[in-house]
């Protein structure tokens, strides 16, 4: 069930998965709703006991989807918009008065105002946020300076109260971004460096997805299910360089190279994998098995479950079974398989609740 | 592959699960064969250049089961005996000299030696270790003060050097309690005490070897797959009491209750779950799918892969399949399944290889 | 969203009596072990009266004789009358659905599908 209001004074009891720093309670709500398994949150206003804890926003998670509330004052509680039905975006235009987002502080310039530092921000291949110091800032050698911002995961490591500076946000996710946008995916290629993270993936364009809306990731690595390498198998590689293309292309049969598509315009989804794979099985943490009549059946099963985050449908027992298939609902701690095997004969696939967070945007 | 040996100077970088506290590198390494995901570990000696990680004791997980290894002075790091083909006990009867176990000290009172005050600890219910002020202690009206403690994990909050203080563990787990051992299940019938953890469990048997090993479990309730509530069936409460004994006994039907056996002498293992559940299926975190004949290999596969903790054995392919049917091999956070599932044809079970570490004991 | 909510605590004198009342939402008694449990400050949460789904009732000696459990299922609503009230029964008083124990001595933390409500206070004056 979809519940958007928040809860004031209320803080949820347990489940804790991480806490990262936001501005509001409003952003909170849209972090734990992009993140793979967060369902609930608690915000801590700066009108909460310990200033140590202002602005922090407790993901959380639950099997019931329900946490027991607790009275606390300044804290304010809410659920994901995973359990809705309307679009969603990650674009936050937002500016934030009198606060200082912090980060790693990369590059400092002079701009007009901040505006125009947002738009540098937005045009940086790594900013993820940045902080204005404005024309009244006391000390007088930092005013009118932009600091751009990034951070290990895209959030703020802390957020404080500063007088007389702004903040805000990268808006490459309200497509905004004049960066290039490379769709090309490169065959028998490998990119040599810097790897962010590693995720199990059953195609390169599942793999581009992923880096799509991974904070830090402009170009990745696939390795196809036929690469020597066992091991290596399925696996999607997250890359970043510091200029921010890839400084070494090394040629590999059965493996393919890409770039994020952060900077584009999309006129397809780009965070939700609808397609189907056929002869292939998702491993992850099993949420429950059910019967149902096929693999679309499957797909809507999962999609429906709101913990459910890809499947596997096997149609083994069809022919037993009144035409019904066994359809294994999963779960990992990232979102994706933790494992993929092929020739087994299942038809495996993800949840369609993503489609919903894709920025309804033309081609750029 | 087995290794015994401990590594001097060597911290084994990444695979944290979580960092308890142990007297020394020995001990830590069967606090981590004991936990039901660590591999590896790393234990920071008083030689190591930051006090205030002294005795801590990291236990690790690696899919790869292995990790980085990096020189650091005052590490010691290793593996698990799971890995290992030897018979095991958590029984450990070493007095630590001039070391202060840390942990909630909920009865003091005067011994004449460290003997006694370990003899005490071992027949308290609650008490998982002691710190023992000798005669020679500074301050002379804690001198002889036999302290018995007790902590959420059974393991110390924290190790501090202090002169002139021994400590030591409960001696249970060495089948050395003289409190009483009650091995009657009772059926019909719900404790409703405190609930200090619950987990998915196939049977009444399991759920007591569950609470056995559990450092604070001393009764339990377990729900069957009959009871009228979906959400409880096949539930495990773990219990505790202040008094050491159910205050409430509840007549319900398709409940079980009992004790832990932490104080009996056993003649049958109580740490492995040995039995087949027919007509069952484990759901937990997917390690491999792999085929085999027959449920007793798939249990055989399981018991020797090593991050394997229960299975399920599907066996409706078997008439395609060479006679072989599939062997999911599956692990959770606990070890125990986070669903069970009826009806649906799958054989379940355990791996065996939670069997070397049962005490080897007379009946008492 | 399965909603338990109390009514009916607040200041009584040694002697005097309340009724307290918990209704649920999003949730049926009819097939539910439901319980009054309570916690004062700086103890653990106990359990003060049960009465599970056949219609079995269970209290706690400390309250035997003075307090009385009932139901209206109709009105999806439990009912803790309360006679006699001492000082010792000022506490924190929660309804509890299919919670068999509290956890940790809290009267919050619940297991998978056991539910709590906020509690009401209830202050016996001497």
């Known amino acids: 069930e979809c519940v958007i209001k928040l809860f004031s004074d209320i803080y949820f009891q347990g489940g804790d998965i991480t806490t990262v720093y936001t501005p509001n309670a409003k952003h909170c709500q849209v972090v734990c709703t992009y993140h793979p398994r967060c369902l609930l949150f608690t915000f801590m206003a700066e009108s909460s006991v310990d200033s140590t804890k202002w602005f922090s926003c407790i993901l959380k998670d639950s099997v019931t989807e329900s946490l027991p509330k607790v009275n606390m004052t300044g804290a304010i509680s809410g659920y994901s918009f995973k359990q809705c039905p309307h679009q969603l975006s990650a674009c936050n235009k937002d500016i934030y008065v009198d606060l200082d987002m912090q980060g790693m502080n990369y590059n400092g310039s002079v701009t007009k105002n901040a505006q125009e530092c947002q738009e540098r921000c937005t045009n940086d291949a790594h900013c993820h946020f940045f902080t204005y110091a404005t024309r009244q800032f006391p000390s007088a050698e930092h005013r009118n300076i932009c600091l751009l911002k990034y951070t290990q995961t895209g959030a703020p490591t802390g957020i404080r109260k500063l007088k007389k500076v702004v903040s805000g946000f990268s808006l490459k996710s309200c497509a905004l971004s004049n960066l290039a946008c490379i769709r090309d995916i490169f065959p028998s290629t490998v990119f040599a460096d810097n790897n962010i993270d590693s995720v199990v993936a059953p195609d390169a364009l599942v793999c581009r997805r992923i880096c799509t809306h991974h904070p830090n990731c402009l170009f990745f690595t696939f390795f196809s299910q036929e690469w020597p390498k066992e091991s290596h198998r399925n696996l999607c590689l997250l890359k970043t360089s510091e200029s921010g293309l890839p400084s070494t292309r090394i040629h590999k049969n059965q493996a393919l190279s890409g770039f994020s598509l952060q900077n584009c315009r999309h006129s397809i989804p780009v965070f939700c994998h609808s397609s189907f794979y056929y002869d292939t099985d998702f491993l992850g943490e099993e949420l429950d098995i059910v019967d149902v009549k096929g693999h679309e059946a499957c797909q809507k099963m999962c999609t429906s479950a709101i913990r459910c985050q890809f499947f596997t449908y096997s149609s083994s027992q069809e022919s037993h079974n009144k035409g019904k298939g066994t359809c294994y609902l999963k779960l990992s701690s990232n979102g994706s398989p933790t494992k993929i095997l092929h020739g087994r004969g299942g038809i495996s696939g993800y949840t369609l609740r993503l489609c919903k967070m894709d920025n309804v945007c033309t081609t750029k | 592959e087995c290794v015994i040996k401990l590594f001097s100077d060597i911290y084994f970088q990444g695979g944290d699960i979580t960092t308890v506290y142990t007297p020394n590198a020995k001990h830590c390494q069967v606090v981590c064969t004991y936990h039901p995901r660590c591999l590896l570990f790393t234990f920071m000696a008083e030689s190591s250049v930051d006090s205030t990680k002294w005795f801590s004791c990291i236990l690790k997980d690696s899919v790869t089961e292995s990790l980085p290894k990096v020189n650091m002075t005052g590490a010691i790091s290793g593996y698990s005996f799971k890995q290992c083909p030897h018979q095991l006990s958590a029984c450990n009867k070493d007095i630590y000299v001039d070391l202060d176990m840390q942990g909630m000290n909920y009865n003091g009172s005067v011994t004449k030696n460290a003997q006694e005050c370990q003899e005490r600890c071992t027949n308290d219910a609650h008490c998982h270790f002691f710190t023992y002020a000798t005669r020679q202690f500074p301050s002379a009206e804690h001198r002889n003060i036999c302290l018995l403690k007790y902590t959420q994990t059974g393991a110390p909050t924290g190790i501090r050097k202090l002169k002139k203080v021994v400590s030591g563990f409960s001696l249970k787990s060495c089948a050395l309690s003289n409190l009483a051992c009650i091995r009657d299940i009772f059926p019909s019938t719900v404790f409703a005490d405190n609930n200090i953890d619950s987990v998915v469990a196939p049977d009444a048997l399991v759920c007591r070897r569950i609470c056995t090993h559990h450092p604070n479990c001393l009764f339990f309730t377990f729900f069957s797959q009959e009871w009228p509530k979906e959400s409880h069936r096949n539930l495990c409460l773990l219990k505790t009491s202040e008094s050491g004994l159910p205050s409430t006994r509840i007549h319900k039907n398709q409940a079980l209750s009992g004790f832990s056996l932490q104080n009996c002498r056993h003649s049958i293992p109580v740490f492995c779950h040995s039995s087949f559940y027919y007509d069952t299926d484990f759901l937990g975190e997917e390690l491999d799918i792999v085929d085999v004949k027959g449920h007793e290999a798939c249990q055989k596969m399981c018991t020797s892969a090593i991050r394997c903790q229960f299975f399920t054995y599907s066996s409706s392919q078997e008439s395609h399949n060479k006679g072989k049917g599939t062997c999911y091999l599956k692990l959770s956070s606990n070890g125990s399944p986070t669903k069970i599932l009826h009806g649906r044809g799958g054989i379940s079970g355990y791996t065996l290889r939670l069997c070397k570490m049962d005490n080897v004991c007379t009946t008492k | 969203q399965v909603q338990l909510v109390e009514s009916g605590g607040g200041s009584v004198q040694a002697g005097g009596s309340l009724r307290l009342s918990c209704t649920a939402s999003?949730?049926?008694?009819?097939?539910?072990?439901m319980a009054w449990y309570r916690q004062a400050p700086g103890n653990e949460c106990e359990l003060v009266s049960t009465?599970?789904?056949?219609?079995?009732?269970y209290y706690a000696d400390s309250v035997k004789g003075r307090f009385t459990i009932s139901q209206d299922n109709s009105k999806n609503t439990m009912y803790l009358q309360m006679n006699s009230l001492r000082a010792e029964d000022t506490a924190v008083y929660y309804c509890?659905?299919?919670?068999?124990?509290?956890?940790?001595?809290?009267?919050?933390?619940?297991?998978?599908?056991?539910?709590w409500g906020q509690g009401t206070l209830v202050t016996v004056s001497s």
């Open positions: 999003e949730f049926t008694f009819d097939d539910s072990d």
């Open positions: 509890a659905a299919d919670q068999w124990g509290s956890a940790e001595g809290d009267c919050t933390s619940s297991y998978p599908g056991g539910y």
């Open positions: 009465i599970t789904s056949d219609g079995g009732t």
